[in-house]
């Protein structure tokens, strides 16, 4: 159908709750596109009625809420006037229990966000909340350890928690939980987020951290177009390289005629404390000699690698 | 649609205190935080603090943190602002202020002003 | 508390031509969740403030589209693509990244 393939890392998710992911990728869609979601490679797009508990809106898919059975591969086709892209996005749901007395015990949140905190800092948690204007949110409420936060070293802030005066005690396990409209029926949303304290002002050293990749497998097809990022994070005054590896070359170097494979341009986002650096790899066309080779993103003295993997063949 | 009305026009001897209104109607009226803000005469806008209506919790910038009080009336949807100790400089307008909505922040609604001047 | 900056004081702009405010805070306010908590206002002479632009670059409700917001963490600019008579006002930018919020002092657009 000549779209082509781009292979976005998988989204895990919790039972019976709205989500939403928003299909777009700023080189393609900052154009005149249509966009047109479908699931599991069927021919028949994701509807468009808004009453439909699984509907597109606008370039948007809306899970309300979201079931134990939609897990799965779903794909967003982009089409521009002389471009087709498709985007495979692999949902995992989960059952989630909280702080169901039934159950016993706090809920185990290290699957979910991980936020941090600087002691002895005024900082703030973020609840992280990606629905389309259809969709009206609040209040939002935070929890502590299965309690309501209250105090003067508290305030909630739109989707944020300020924390005046961060101490050790306020490591732990919160959930953000807000309220979301849409069509006149209510859902509740809830976002655990696992808290940890640094006393280091940003981030210390000068070692970098690779965020992504995490020395993985990423199942593609033969003869798609991939893109990768290798996020890292790092000081603001570091001095060190960020770059893609392959058999300890350059991945420019090693595809030095054909091109195929390549390093995109570096680009990073300044925060208070620390940069954000974005690098990736773009593998034009997949091919077999591309699997089980493992690609890597260096950073400074970090490393973390990609290994491309077949898909297993479906049989059903 | 969102409505803030506000208390008339207040004239005050140095010293004394003025308490200004703020009426809300046409949302949830303790889902919001309320911000006052003033405006000294041909001056910029300052931030006084905040008022969580449902818990009445006030956030205050600092400045202001010995005279002022916050309290609302949730059966008429009203807060409240008393500022006490007033001397010449806190001539100004008093604006309060609701968010966009609950999850962006900026004020997009506001009320439309009360004129307080101390003057002996 | 985080000072916002503001230039220039006042600017003078023929109706039709491109208009540029810009605002500069004292400390970062992209937040590590990808937002950057920085506003724009219009004070219209005798009335209160209007939300022009919020997080940094959306379009308030009802806001035309000749305004336009950027920036980086720390410098911000709005941008009036035409000028019209209505848009005359002193132009404030804020910041509500943390506790006390504050504003810039302002800058007066008038209309050659």
């Known amino acids: 159908d000549g779209c082509k393939d781009i292979f976005m890392k998988n989204e895990i998710l919790s039972a019976s709750q709205p989500f939403a992911f928003n299909c777009t990728f700023p080189p393609i869609t900052s154009g005149e596109v249509s966009v047109t979601w479908y699931k599991n490679s069927s021919k028949i797009p994701v509807s468009k009625i808004i009453q439909s508990r699984i509907h597109q809106d606008e370039t948007w898919i809306l899970f309300l809420p979201m079931e134990w059975g939609d897990s799965g591969v779903y794909q967003c086709v982009i089409k521009g006037r002389d471009s087709c892209h498709r985007i495979h996005v692999n949902l995992t749901v989960f059952e989630k229990h909280w702080c169901d007395t039934s159950i016993g015990g706090l809920p185990n949140l290290s699957d979910e966000y991980k936020q941090i905190l600087h002691l002895g800092k005024d900082d703030s948690l973020t609840c992280h909340l990606h629905f389309p204007k259809s969709c009206v949110l609040g209040p939002i409420k935070w929890y502590k350890d299965c309690n309501e936060i209250k105090g003067e070293r508290f305030t909630v802030l739109e989707t944020r928690l300020l924390v005046s005066n961060v101490s050790a005690e306020d490591r732990g396990n919160y959930a953000c939980q807000a309220i979301l409209t849409h069509s006149g029926k209510q859902y509740e949303v809830l976002n655990g987020i696992t808290v940890s304290i640094t006393e280091r002002a940003g981030y210390g050293g000068s070692v970098p951290k690779i965020i992504y990749p995490k020395n993985h497998s990423i199942e593609v097809q033969l003869g798609t177009t991939l893109i990768v990022d290798c996020n890292v994070t790092d000081t603001k005054d570091n001095t060190n390289l960020r770059c893609w590896r392959v058999n300890n070359t350059l991945v420019d170097d090693y595809y030095d005629e054909s091109k195929r494979i390549r390093e995109g341009v570096e680009t990073h986002v300044s925060f208070r404390e620390h940069n954000l650096y974005t690098v990736n790899i773009t593998f034009l066309e997949v091919k077999m000699e591309d699997y089980g080779l493992p690609f890597m993103c260096h950073a400074g003295v970090s490393t973390a690698y990609i290994i491309l993997q077949l898909p297993a063949p479906d049989f059903r | 649609q969102v409505q803030l009305v506000q208390s008339g026009a207040e004239v005050k001897k140095p010293g004394a205190s003025v308490k200004v209104s703020c009426k809300a109607s046409g949302y949830t009226f303790t889902n919001y935080w309320m911000n006052w803000v003033r405006q000294a005469p041909r001056q910029g806008l300052e931030w006084m603090g905040m008022f969580e209506p449902s818990n009445a919790v006030t956030r205050l910038n600092q400045k202001f943190k010995d005279r002022v009080t916050m309290t609302r009336d949730t059966s008429t949807s009203t807060v409240y602002m008393e500022l006490s100790s007033l001397r010449s400089e806190d001539t100004a307008v008093y604006y309060c202020?609701?968010?966009?909505?609950?999850?962006?922040?900026?004020?997009?609604?506001w009320g439309q002003g009360t004129l307080v001047t101390v003057s002996s | 508390d985080i000072v916002m900056t503001q230039t220039p004081l006042s600017l003078s702009v023929t109706p039709g031509q491109p208009a540029s405010i810009s605002c500069r805070s004292s400390?970062?306010?992209?937040?590590?969740?990808?937002?950057?908590?920085f506003y724009w206002y219009l004070q219209k002479p005798g009335q209160p403030p209007q939300l022009l632009i919020y997080?940094?670059?959306n379009l308030a409700s009802g806001v035309p589209d000749r305004f336009s917001g950027s920036g980086s963490g720390t410098d911000f600019t709005l941008k009036i693509s035409r000028v019209e008579a209505e848009d005359v006002g002193v132009y404030y930018c804020a910041q509500n990244l943390e506790l006390p919020l504050t504003f810039g002092g302002g800058t007066k657009v008038e209309i050659k």
């Open positions: 997080q940094m670059s």
């Open positions: 202020a609701r968010t966009t909505s609950m999850i962006i922040g900026g004020f997009a609604y």
């Open positions: 400390k970062s306010l992209l937040h590590s969740n990808a937002i950057t908590y």
